[in-house]
Every structure is written in C-alpha cells, then in structure tokens.
C-alpha cells in the first residue's frame, strides 16, 4: 500500500467517512502510521 503523507491522509479520510466520524479525536494523519490501517 502507498505510505506517502498524501495517501495516508486520503486513506484516513475514507475511514472517517465510512465510520461516520466516530473515532478518537487523536486519530489524525500526523499521528497515525500506515500500520493503523
């Protein structure tokens, strides 16, 4: 999987969208690694 900063941000956006945004407040691009996915 792509692990660039932009890929991580888009992937997290998709995850947040699918979860309805119900995730921890600290679940943001700069403090989740690719392993979080």
């Amino acid at each position: 999987a792509c692990d660039t900063a932009t890929c991580v941000t888009h992937r997290l956006a998709g995850l947040l969208s699918r979860s309805g945004g119900v995730v921890k407040n600290n679940f943001v691009p700069t403090n989740v690694g690719s392993k979080a996915f």
Epitope: C2, T4, A5, C7, T9, H10, L12, P29, T30
Partner: antibody, heavy 119, light 107 residues
Framework: EVQLVQSGAEVKKPGASVKVSCKAS????????MNWVRQAPGQRLEWIGV????????TYNRKFKGRATLTVDKSASTAYMELSSLRSEDTAVYYC????????????WGQGTTVTVSS | DIQMTQSPSSLSASVGDRVTITCKAS??????VAWYQQKPGKSPKALIY???YRYSGVPSRFSGSGSGTDFTLTISSLQPEDVATYHC?????????FGQGTKLEIK
C-alpha cells in the same frame, strides 16, 4: 475559514539563503502534513518536501536534500522552508500546501512567495 | 523518480466542447493521482484526487479516470472560466511529481 498565508517576495544574491514562512489558520495545524512546492518560470510544479508538524519529521525530494530545510513553530501554527546556496535556477514561486480532512476535505495552497535570485 | 507526461501541452477549444487531457506515468502509480487547475498569477486549485474523485465544490463537468499508468481529466462542457493550466500529480511515491501542464484556451 482555512488560510495558509505566506511571507512576502524576496530578492537574494547567489549563494545566499532564503526562509519562507506559511502561517496556517482555521484548522488544527499539527493534525495535517505540510508540503512545499515550487514553480520556476515556464517550468512544471516541483515538490520540495513534506513535514509532519506533530513530530517534526521530514521527507525531502533528493534534488533538494542538504539545501532545503523544513521546520515548524507549533505555537505559532507556522511552517518554514529555508533554501540555502541559492542559484539563479532557484528563482521561482514557492508554495506551501496542506491536504485537510477537517473542517473541509480539501487540498489548500498558500498564495505563493516569489523568490528572485539575481546578482 | 516517476515521470508524468501530459498531453497535449496546449489546446484551444470552443465553449461547450468536451475537452480531454491525458497524463501518463512512467510506472504504475495505482490510482494515486491528483489534478489541479491553475489560473495565471494564482495558486493551483485542487480538482480531483485518487484519479476520479472530485473535491467538494468542484463543478460536475470536471471528471477524472484511469489507473496504473494512464489517466484522463475530462471537462464535459467547456466554460469560459475554465481557461487555465491543468496539472496532474502522482503521490504514490516520493518524490511527488507533476506533469508539465496543459494550457487550455478558448477559441
């Protein structure tokens, strides 16, 4: 409203350094990566590097490694790009850009800073 | 580094025309491609991400497609305000790289 406001135009001599600032507002600065991109006259956009404002970790384009330095001041929500050993080919418009998820899922760019390198 | 080759480098079309700009990557970048619109003297504005997804607020006449090495930006019905230079970008690998730009003019 999300804004990335960059510092003003600079004129530098060959061999000098320049430091461009990018002040972020309207979102949580440390949550999103900050990219730096430049555009020389008549040339394609060129990615310089990216910084994680939360950790300070950087990734650079090999072309600029050793000459470009990306830093942040978290307390001021400001990112900086310093380029050293300037040459005429570094004459360009320099942009900061950040891809956000909140408050809006969008790729925001600063207004650009013109750096002219001339003897 | 990944080379992004855009074509054409410039084009002239009439209002209402369907316009297609292509971008070819030198190796597989999946769908990790973005498209930007840049008007003279302005910063690039994001249009498309992940090859085919429009950002909110981008008119529906703009669409993107492709995967692997071949990508397309289509404007279904050209409007006067679409006069600009369009750039593709791959973000699958560091360093991110851009196409050389396509300058779009109205006939």
């Amino acid at each position: 409203e999300v804004q990335l406001v960059q510092s003003g135009a600079e004129v530098k001599k060959p061999g000098a350094s320049v430091k461009v600032s990018c002040k972020a507002s309207g979102y949580t600065f440390t949550d999103y990566y900050m990219n730096w991109v430049r555009q020389a006259p008549g040339q394609r956009l060129e990615w310089i590097g990216v910084i994680n404002p939360y950790t300070g970790r950087t990734t650079y384009n090999r072309k600029f490694k050793g000459r470009a330095t990306l830093t942040v001041d978290k307390s001021a929500s400001t990112a900086y790009m310093e380029l050293s050993s300037l040459r005429s080919e570094d004459t360009a418009v320099y942009y900061c850009a950040s891809l956000l998820i909140r408050p809006h899922y969008f790729d925001y760019w600063g207004q650009g800073t013109t750096v002219t390198v001339s003897s | 580094d990944i080379q992004m080759t855009q074509s054409p480098s410039s084009l002239s079309a009439s209002v209402g025309d369907r316009v297609t700009i292509t971008c070819k990557a030198s190796q597989n970048v999946g769908t990790n491609v973005a498209w930007y619109q840049q008007k003279p003297g302005k910063s690039p504005k994001a249009l498309i991400y992940s090859a085919s997804y429009r950002y909110s607020g981008v008119p529906s006449r703009f669409s993107g497609s492709g995967s692997g090495t071949d990508f397309t930006l289509t404007i279904s019905s050209l409007q006067p305000e679409d006069v600009a230079t369009y750039h593709c970008q791959q973000y699958n690998f560091y360093p991110y790289t851009f196409g050389q730009g396509t300058k779009l003019e109205i006939k």
